[in-house]
């Protein structure tokens, strides 16, 4: 059985409007239906109806249509609001322009190319023919308009009242003509509803024979009228969906305006130096992604190929290689112009309304309520709103949702280093933002620092691989190397993140690193079968004032008799006094000869009070130091140890409690050394492993 | 911060130039050697970090050496040239890593001459 | 390697003009540059970091823009006091560098 054609493509709907007619001539026909589509079938075939259907009505509450044989244009009608009809006028009726070879044309020139007047189609002078309407019933040979009944090449056409002159074409012009738009036509209303290869669109209010997401009630400021070509998501020019089964989308012919100029009302307002809103007015030049990996070409299609060219987008500004937001995104853009990253956030701009006021926050900041949104390194905070999913995923109880609004930096999972928030960039999902805490604040984040209330230790034994100890226990120790040279030590704390400090990195090109696993000797001597040599893919810098980093691998290391990792305490736990621990190192050790291998040197804990008289009083260590004094004279980290962990061992666990930061002199006698404390961080450590994406094995 | 050691010296007579600072740690910020010699640019020729590694510029390795004590910052010319005559400045690197100079001495002028 | 391109080599503006100062590196830095003004007999003092952030005390008719590898200092409503020589500096990677500095633009105002 042949499927019906759904016609209600074919007619322009004008909805909350019914017409009345004023000239008592005029003929109606209704009938009780279900749906619209029902009355544009009966419409369109005049079946049953004693006239020519040009328009109807349907009547949502009573669910009946009224058939017109006249539409708004026609004299002595008027149109009326009414909540509950929409008018659906016939586009063939209403339509002053043609399409292809003009067969469904049924507008009202009646006025040829050079001209003359038409003859009317039922009148035999001066003009003996043989287009009779009776004999072309449907295409509307009335009055004395012009068509195109049998669909010549010429378009519309018509006999003329010159005797001299039998007939000749109308000067009807194509709809493709007619129709025309500014930029890529995203602010494009016009009556264009075929694609360029002449398929009929499907109506925006419609899910068949395509569904899809652009609903006009879901996007009232999108123009979707109809069935007709519109942009609403930045493509290089207006499209719709097609009533082919077969093919879901096409671009309509709509050609430029010869005058490219867009209204006020469409121009985004255009800024240089910042971003407003999602930055589509952004003209800047600014020319990397938030990392720094420069922007490819707009106009290049090397290396990545792309439709987002500065012909397609005409209004865009898509100059040389500047950031744009050309298609509604976040934020401004580019393609990189490394071949492994196709685009890339200019996340680095800053925004205009951002609050520059001298904000601060008291204890952790989770009561925090200004409206910074903006990271320490200057990405734009993403809305919370948007992230739900992700911190639900890291906190175990409900977020007070009336505190996140907007993209404001907040506290919502109570950590320990102040507001933070999400950033819309993979690579960097959060970070903590540029905010201090308040003067004379002296809210303690971690209470009971030296007294043993939480143990460092979590409950399960020291792990051994295969059931072999690795080589003197020592697998988690990392050389970090630059330029192939070691500069600092490291901690391995899961297969893809090294715990390390924040001076060992004096470049910002990732380039100039590499780690080095599984080795004794500095150099790599005699090591040849369990060294692993990894590069470095990012560096997650710790909270202000930490001097810590995470550096991430570029691809998981192998864990195996060599290499391991080393356990975290746990958050905000103390080690008791006198805990004996261990720094280790490749760095600087007094000798002339120095063989290179791996030194460790013992350690004992001291508490924070005592290790200040140590210090004679000129140090006062907070709750994020650690101190540890020598049992031997003398020994203790220095240059090249930077970086490295201080180990101490609980409950026959081995855990990395403190961290060798430069700043406190070399293992001088009598003074012990003050280390980063790793259980201050052990939440944003987690953190960071839980919501940073690492390459899979 | 104030760079001393400059003089006039004949060609290949090694040259130390110091630099001494005071109200900040040099545990906390890297510093640097720049150079101008007589109506040119300035040059950058090394770099000392917090973590007492070092880097030079391509020409200036081998050229030069940078080192630190606790309060000095030395940097030592083993064989001069006449094209190493030049005012040496001595600079703090805002940061323990490589960064902008926020801090500069006032110049130590270093004639070689025969 | 991270070298430094800069020009004009000399530029002569009116008081109360703008002058530009143009700054290119030999590959992307992101947003690690820093300008610096120095007057005969002194050493350099830094205007602008991180390509665009005033160094304190600096007038805000200075600005700096840019990222990657395209920088520029502008100084806007020039006075006497600006004649000096302007020189910009990478602060992004030391790696088999020439000069981190750009070769210095000369600002003579009439």
């Known amino acids: 059985q042949r499927k019906r054609r759904n016609t209600i493509h074919e007619f322009k709907k004008s909805a909350k409007t019914t017409l009345i007619k004023i000239d008592p001539a005029l003929k109606i026909k209704t009938k009780k239906v279900n749906t619209a589509d029902q009355c544009a079938n009966r419409c369109t075939r005049n079946k049953g109806l004693p006239f020519t259907c040009k328009a109807f009505v349907f009547d949502k509450a009573r669910k009946q249509c009224l058939w017109f044989p006249f539409n708004s244009m026609s004299s002595g009608v008027k149109k009326e609001f009414g909540h509950e009809f929409d008018l659906y006028e016939n586009k063939d009726y209403i339509r002053n322009c043609i399409i292809g070879k003009g067969r469904s044309y049924k507008g009202t020139v009646s006025i040829t190319k050079s001209g003359i007047k038409c003859q009317p189609w039922s009148s035999m002078i001066p003009h003996e023919h043989s287009f009779l309407p009776s004999s072309y019933r449907g295409k509307d040979l009335q009055e004395n308009y012009c068509r195109n009944p049998r669909g010549e090449e010429g378009g519309p056409w018509c006999f003329t009242s010159n005797p001299e002159v039998r007939y000749e074409v109308c000067d009807i012009p194509q709809c493709s003509e007619v129709e025309c738009m500014t930029c890529n036509g995203e602010s494009y209303r016009g009556l264009m509803d075929h694609t360029e290869s002449g398929k009929i669109c499907q109506r925006w209010d419609h899910q068949t024979p395509h569904r899809h997401k652009f609903l006009p009630e879901r996007y009232p400021d999108k123009g979707f009228d109809d069935n007709y070509c519109r942009n609403p998501d930045g493509q290089p020019r207006p499209w719709c969906y097609t009533l082919d089964p077969h093919t879901r989308w096409e671009y309509c012919a709509i050609k430029t305006c010869a005058d490219n100029t867009m209204n006020d009302t469409d121009v985004p307002l255009e800024t240089t130096e910042c971003i407003q809103g999602q930055g589509e007015g952004y003209r800047g030049t600014v020319n990397t992604i938030w990392n720094g990996i420069p922007c490819q070409r707009w106009d290049s299609q090397y290396p990545h190929e792309h439709d987002m060219t500065p012909e397609n987008f005409k209004c865009k500004d898509l100059r040389e290689n500047y950031c744009r937001n050309p298609d509604g995104s976040e934020s401004p853009w580019c393609f990189t112009t490394d071949p492994n990253i196709r685009v890339g956030y200019c996340s680095q701009i800053p925004n205009c309304d951002m609050s520059h006021g001298q904000d601060c926050y008291r204890g952790n900041g989770k009561n925090y309520m200004g409206n910074l949104s903006q990271t320490r390194s200057g990405l734009t905070c993403s809305m919370w709103d948007k992230n739900m999913e992700d911190l639900h995923r890291h906190i175990f109880w409900e977020p007070d949702a009336s505190k996140l609004n907007e993209n404001y930096c907040r506290n919502p999972d109570d950590d320990a280093h102040g507001p933070w928030c999400y950033t819309g960039n993979p690579l960097i999902p959060w970070d903590y933002c540029p905010i201090s805490r308040c003067e004379g604040d002296t809210t303690p984040t971690i209470v009971n620092l030296d007294h043993p209330v939480i143990s460092c230790a979590k409950t399960k034994q020291l792990r051994v691989v295969n059931g072999i100890p690795t080589r003197t226990n020592i697998g988690w120790m990392v050389s970090l190397r630059y330029r192939n040279k070691h500069i600092c030590g490291g901690s391995l704390i899961k297969e893809s993140w090294v715990l390390t400090a924040r001076q060992c990195f004096p470049s910002r090109d990732l380039k100039d690193y590499e780690a080095w696993l599984g080795i004794h000797d500095v150099h790599g001597r005699g090591d040849e079968k369990c060294k692993q040599v990894l590069n470095v893919s990012q560096l997650v810098y710790g909270p202000e004032g930490s001097d810590l980093v995470l550096m991430k691998l570029a691809r998981p290391a192998v864990l195996d008799d060599f290499v391991s990792t080393i356990d975290l305490p746990n958050y905000g736990c103390t080690i008791p006094e006198k805990t004996s621990c261990s720094v280790y190192g490749w760095g600087y050790t007094g000798l002339i000869n120095y063989d290179g291998l791996l030194r460790v040197a013992h350690l004992y804990i001291m508490g924070n009070e005592k290790c200040s008289q140590h210090h004679r009083g000129k140090v006062t260590l907070n709750e994020s130091e650690i101190c540890a004094g020598a049992e031997k004279i003398g020994s203790g980290p220095c240059e090249g140890d930077y970086g490295g962990p201080l180990v101490c061992e609980q409950h026959k666990m081995r855990m990395v409690l403190g961290v060798i930061v430069p700043g406190r002199g070399c293992a001088i006698p009598n003074r012990p050394g003050i280390f980063v404390r790793v259980a201050y961080y052990a939440k944003w450590i987690h953190k960071i492993i839980l919501t940073y994406k690492v390459p899979q094995s | 911060v104030e760079e001393s050691g400059g003089r006039l010296v004949t060609p290949g007579t090694p040259l130390t130039l110091t630099c001494t600072v005071s109200g900040f740690s040099l545990s906390a910020y890297a510093m640097s050697w720049v150079r101008q010699a007589p109506e040119k640019g300035l040059e950058w020729i090394a770099v000392i970090y917090v973590i007492g590694a070092t880097d030079y510029a391509s020409w200036a390795k081998g050229r030069f050496t940078i080192s630190r004590t606790s309060t000095t910052v030395d940097l030592r010319i083993p064989s001069p040239t006449t094209e190493d005559t030049a005012t040496y400045f001595c600079?703090?690197?805002?940061?323990?890593?490589?960064?902008?100079?926020?801090?500069w001495g006032p110049g130590t002028l270093v004639t070689v001459s025969s | 390697a991270y070298d430094m391109t800069q020009t004009p080599a000399s530029v002569e503006v009116a008081v109360g003009g703008t002058v530009t100062i143009k700054c290119q590196a030999s590959?992307?830095?992101?947003?690690?540059l820093a300008w610096y003004q120095q007057k005969p007999g002194q050493p350099p003092k830094l205007l602008i970091y991180q390509a665009s952030k005033l160094a304190s005390g600096v007038p805000s008719r200075f600005k700096g823009s840019g990222s990657g590898t395209e920088f520029t200092l502008t100084i806007s409503g020039v006075e006497c006091a600006d004649a000096a020589t302007y020189y910009c500096?990478?602060?992004?990677?030391?790696?088999?560098?020439?000069?981190?500095f750009g070769g210095g633009t000369e600002v003579v105002v009439k």
């Open positions: 600079a703090r690197v805002y940061d323990s890593v490589w960064n902008h100079f926020n801090l």
């Open positions: 590959q992307s830095i992101s947003s690690w």
């Open positions: 500096q990478q602060a992004y990677s030391v790696s088999n560098v020439d000069n981190a």
